[in-house]
């Protein structure tokens, strides 16, 4: 039918960027590229009905169902969902196509179902049917990749037993240290499961699916590098595969490599060697030690020896269960308003942890960095000098860990005052927690120097706002001070602030700010 418009239906998946820090909350979403829903004319239906492919959405995900209409003239539209009409506002894109969108924020069970879009154009009327279901994410898994030797080949296969099936990539780097960061130009990524080039400096395999990304580094001892001050340590759980690569470069081929476990040569079938000439004609040899499924007795010192290099060792520790080792005692910090400061947690963990920093019910991304001594560190610097309670939470498959921090910002008190018919109260959040004085202003004491001691009740830290303490002082009204101006002052080691209150009749009182440093 030539009168029918050309229409395209797409699904746009939005990544909820809740953890974004300092971004405008009016646009918290990052969109993925649209997926075609292949709108097709529904056969044997009365009227013109297009049907989009059904869509499956994760709980709490945000999506847009969008229709692009290539038809002349204006269009009007109406969305219908569960017999309710929903507002529809078409607009035109740069190619002058009509665009109609339905945004579903934070998908819930109640938002699943059939969405009908009725479109009226100058030429014709038609209906588009969308079906939206909730995806069963309970079945999702993302497992850390592991290595296997390829049968009859000198190559490694990277395996991640995850659902949905992950995209597996090798991340290779031939530089040292910092230049091997993920975004560095020295890093090469290969989206394949099998790797033949095993001579690189740094070799990692990563697997990613809807749940995120997990990586495993090929543990390497480089005999041409100065050994670390502390012995490198590798943790594995019973049943996991062990892979250690020993690498050495020499001016010619006249050298050999061997592996020993606790001074005993590894059995045949637990190692394989590869060698190549580098661009400057030096010989590179690598010798892999591997155990397909480790047991407790595979624990020990693995030593790689060379006839031309000093030998180096690594301690392999086989554990029954994963762990997170760190001190969980809470820590309090007191800093100045403009002082640079980061919280940090030093921990040893296996398998690698997933972690978050939380403040004021908001979660922030957590970065970890490996240290030379086998420990890792996570730092959080983005506190923006907000006092309160900060929480570090880490977990892996077998263990959980939580550590609390309190941040106090040294500052002069700021005073807020309020009054009722029977009392006046002043509040301050300065730190260190302030002390209070009340003074009466009268003809005898125009500078408000007459101190009030009767009827004063101080409460330190009466209100805890996400770990931020607030101090208050209340003055009970007596006949002696009714009708007078009184002044409450909060002072600490950084200064004093005062607020003046007129004690006359009930209701809100005007405050006269009067700061004295």
């Amino acid at each position: 039918n030539q009168d029918l418009p050309v229409i395209k239906c797409v699904l746009i998946n939005h990544k909820n960027n809740d953890s974004s820090v300092g971004k405008s909350s009016s646009y918290p979403m990052v969109s993925e590229s649209p997926e075609d829903l292949g709108c097709a004319l529904r056969p044997q239906s009365s009227g013109t009905v297009y049907e989009a492919a059904a869509v499956e959405v994760d709980v709490s995900a945000s999506i847009t169902l969008q229709v692009l209409v290539d038809a002349p003239g204006n269009i009007s539209c109406l969305w219908v969902f569960k017999h309710s009409s929903l507002n529809c506002q078409p607009h035109f894109d740069l190619q002058n196509r009509g665009v109609v969108s339905m945004v579903i924020l934070k998908m819930t069970e109640t938002q699943a179902g059939e969405y009908l879009l009725f479109i009226q154009s100058e030429a014709t009327n038609y209906t588009i049917l969308f079906t939206v279901s909730i995806r069963n994410t309970l079945l999702y898994t993302l497992r850390r990749p592991y290595f296997r030797k390829m049968e009859n080949q000198d190559a490694l296969v990277c395996i991640s037993e995850s659902v949905p099936e992950p995209i597996v990539e090798w991340v290779l780097c031939d530089s040292q240290g910092e230049s091997c960061k993920e975004e560095s130009p020295a890093v090469v990524k290969k989206e394949e499961k099998v790797l033949h080039e095993l001579f690189g400096t740094d070799i990692r395999c990563c697997a990613r699916n809807e749940l995120g990304r997990e990586c495993t580094r090929l543990f390497t001892i480089d005999l041409n590098q100065t050994p670390q001050t502390t012995l490198p340590q590798l943790f594995l759980k019973v049943g996991e595969p062990l892979w250690i690569r020993c690498k050495a470069v020499h001016v010619n081929h006249g050298f050999g490599l061997t592996w020993e476990l606790e001074n005993k040569a590894l059995e045949e079938g637990n190692y394989f060697e590869m060698s190549t000439y580098s661009t400057n004609r030096t010989m590179i040899r690598i010798l892999f030690a591997f155990v397909s499924s480790v047991a407790r007795n595979d624990t020990g010192y693995y030593t790689c020896s060379s006839s031309k290099h000093p030998s180096q060792s690594a301690l392999v520790t086989i554990v029954e269960k994963g762990f997170i080792n760190a001190t969980n005692s809470s820590e309090d910090y007191e800093i100045d308003q403009y002082e640079e400061f980061c919280f940090s947690v030093r921990f040893k963990a296996y398998p690698q942890i997933r972690c978050t920093w939380t403040f004021s019910r908001k979660s922030f991304p957590c970065e970890q960095k490996g240290l030379d001594n086998g420990y890792s560190i996570s730092k959080f610097c983005n506190h923006k000098h907000q006092p309160g309670e900060y929480i570090f939470h880490a977990e892996n498959d077998d263990a959980q860990f939580t550590k609390m921090f309190t941040l106090n910002i040294r500052r002069k008190p700021q005073v807020l005052a309020e009054a009722s018919a029977s009392q006046a109260s002043c509040f301050s959040d300065g730190y260190p927690l302030p002390s209070w004085t009340w003074k009466k202003c009268s003809d005898k004491s125009p500078n408000c120097t007459e101190e009030i001691t009767e009827g004063v009740w101080n409460r330190k830290a009466n209100r805890k706002v996400f770990g931020q303490w607030v101090s208050s002082s209340t003055l009970n009204m007596s006949e002696a001070i009714k009708g007078f101006l009184v002044k409450c002052c909060a002072y600490n080691s950084l200064g004093t602030s005062c607020e003046t209150i007129l004690l006359n009749s009930p209701g809100p009182f005007p405050f006269i700010q009067d700061n004295i440093s």
Partner: nanobody, 125 residues
């Protein structure tokens, strides 16, 4: 790249039953939403049934609802279509189909990325 191979078609009497199978090879089966389509002689290919990648959700054409059941066994890399109470109008070549996304279910032909070669089902007395 995914290869799909259907089997189980044949001649069956009206009211009878038949089970179609679709074996997949190539990239792991569990990543795909899968479906069955059919094409009767002289007609366009039409949607019959679909199943999400996890097997959690199923979708059927109105004409087969209550009679056909789609299922999958990810451990065997196989998709099934159990057809009961077959009618003459179910006669067609049945195609196994896979999509390229875990979010979009193969309920319309344009989203199909991979097709099987088809298996003929004839319902006749």
């Amino acid at each position: 790249e995914v290869q799909l191979l259907e089997s189980g078609g044949g001649l069956v009497q009206p009211g009878g039953s038949l089970t179609l199978s679709c074996a997949a090879s190539g990239r792991t089966f569990s990543s795909y939403a899968l479906g069955w389509f059919r094409q009767a002689p002289g007609k366009e290919r039409e949607f019959v049934a679909a199943i999400s990648w996890s097997g959690g959700n199923t979708y059927y054409a109105d004409s087969v609802k209550g009679r056909f059941t789609i299922s999958r066994d990810n451990s065997k890399n196989t998709l099934y279509l159990q057809m009961n109470s077959l009618r003459a109008e179910d006669t067609a070549v049945y195609y196994c189909a896979a999509g390229g996304s875990t979010r979009v279910v193969v309920t319309t032909t344009p989203v199909v990325k991979y097709w099987g070669q088809g298996t003929l089902v004839t319902v006749s007395s």
